[in-house]
């Protein structure tokens, strides 16, 4: 077959690759599997570090951060007086909030 | 439409085991954060059991008193399982399966509920 | 962890307003990290306040959440006849892991 991804439909704006005589499809974020028709999981590898919790979200995940951890995924210890390990805390968050 | 059945309860034999399951449809568990069981006495109030994480990680919590006698599993991406040995007279309930999601940075927030499955604890 | 409510039963006619309180033993995660339910007989639970003070889908504005850390509280006002249930707050916490406690209920009696 000259064109292995002719007729092969890749779904949710995945993209068919060819190679080796065979084809597959590369997943648009948020989607996996054969045909990108499933969600992907974006909790598999858990990703929230010390102890917070998973959650898949409309933009990919969310952690909510064990009291005392904040950041993206509760990796910045918060410390005693308040402050983070961050440079600089994003504005609007407060330890221990989930974070995007 | 989004919807949580339990199966499972009936009649067991004090110190017996039973596995109740719960099946989702309209959803799928690997985008709608953790799947619970809470359970009720009769007449009495909601109690905690256990979640386990809708995704592959099968991240689980449990309530202190349910440690040991009570496992969660998920068994398909819409079928999460309560295993339950060791039964006594004061396990008889009613067991809900719930869904925990995350909302406006709050978590533990069951926003679909199945109408429950009784277990009697009974000789 | 622990959640007290009070007081239970309470009971106020068509059109008025009932108070409950739910108090934690300890604060609860973020100080906002509770839930109130609605029971009906026969029925499983429904959510009806997130966050202490954010109204889930569907229900009505006469429920109101207020409160944060140990002290929360559930106002309903121009109740109706529908609103007779057993009303329960939840917490959620950490220490060495999560978990949820839900307080004893509380039963409103509308007549």
């Known amino acids: 077959d000259l064109d292995d991804c002719a007729g092969r439909a890749c779904a949710n704006g995945g993209t068919c690759v060819e190679g080796g005589g065979a084809h597959r499809c590369s997943c648009a974020l948020g989607f996996g599997g054969r045909d990108c028709r499933e969600r992907a999981d974006p909790c598999a590898a858990r990703p929230c570090a010390h102890g917070g919790r998973c959650y898949a979200h409309f933009s990919g995940l969310v952690c909510a951060c064990a009291p005392g951890y904040m950041g993206a995924r509760c990796e910045f210890p918060v410390h005693p007086d308040g402050a983070s390990a961050l440079p600089a805390a994003p504005p609007g968050l407060r330890p221990g909030d989930p974070q995007r | 439409q989004e919807q949580l059945v339990e199966s499972g309860g009936g009649l067991v034999q004090p110190e017996g085991s039973l596995t109740l399951t719960c099946t989702a449809s309209g959803f799928s568990f690997s985008s709608s954060g953790y799947m619970c069981w809470v359970r009720q006495a009769p007449g009495k109030g909601l109690e905690w059991i256990a979640c386990i994480s809708g995704g592959s990680s099968g991240d689980t919590d449990y309530a202190n008193w349910a440690k040991g006698r009570f496992s969660i599993s998920k068994t398909s991406s819409t079928t999460v399982t309560l295993q339950m040995t060791s039964l006594t007279v004061a396990d008889t309930a009613t067991y809900f399966c719930?869904?925990?999601?995350?909302?406006?940075?709050?978590?533990?927030?069951?926003?679909?509920w199945g109408p429950g499955t009784l277990v009697t604890v009974s000789s | 962890q622990v959640l007290t409510q009070t007081p239970s039963p309470v009971s106020a006619a068509v059109g008025g307003t009932v108070t409950i309180s739910c108090q934690a033993s300890?604060?609860?995660?973020?100080?906002?990290?509770l839930a109130w339910y609605q029971q009906k007989p026969g029925q499983p639970p429904k959510l009806l306040i997130y966050?202490?003070?954010s109204l889930a889908s569907g229900v009505p504005s006469r429920f109101k959440g207020s409160g944060a850390g140990t002290q929360f509280t559930l106002t309903i006002s121009d109740l109706e006849c529908d609103d007779a249930a057993t009303y329960y707050c939840?917490?959620?916490?950490?220490?060495?892991?999560?978990?949820?406690?839900f307080g004893g209920g509380t039963e409103v009696v509308v007549k």
């Open positions: 966050a202490a003070s």
């Open positions: 939840q917490g959620t916490y950490y220490s060495s892991g999560w978990y949820s406690t």
């Open positions: 719930a869904r925990d999601v995350y909302i406006d940075s709050t978590i533990f927030n069951f926003n679909l």
């Open positions: 300890q604060s609860v995660y973020n100080n906002n990290n």
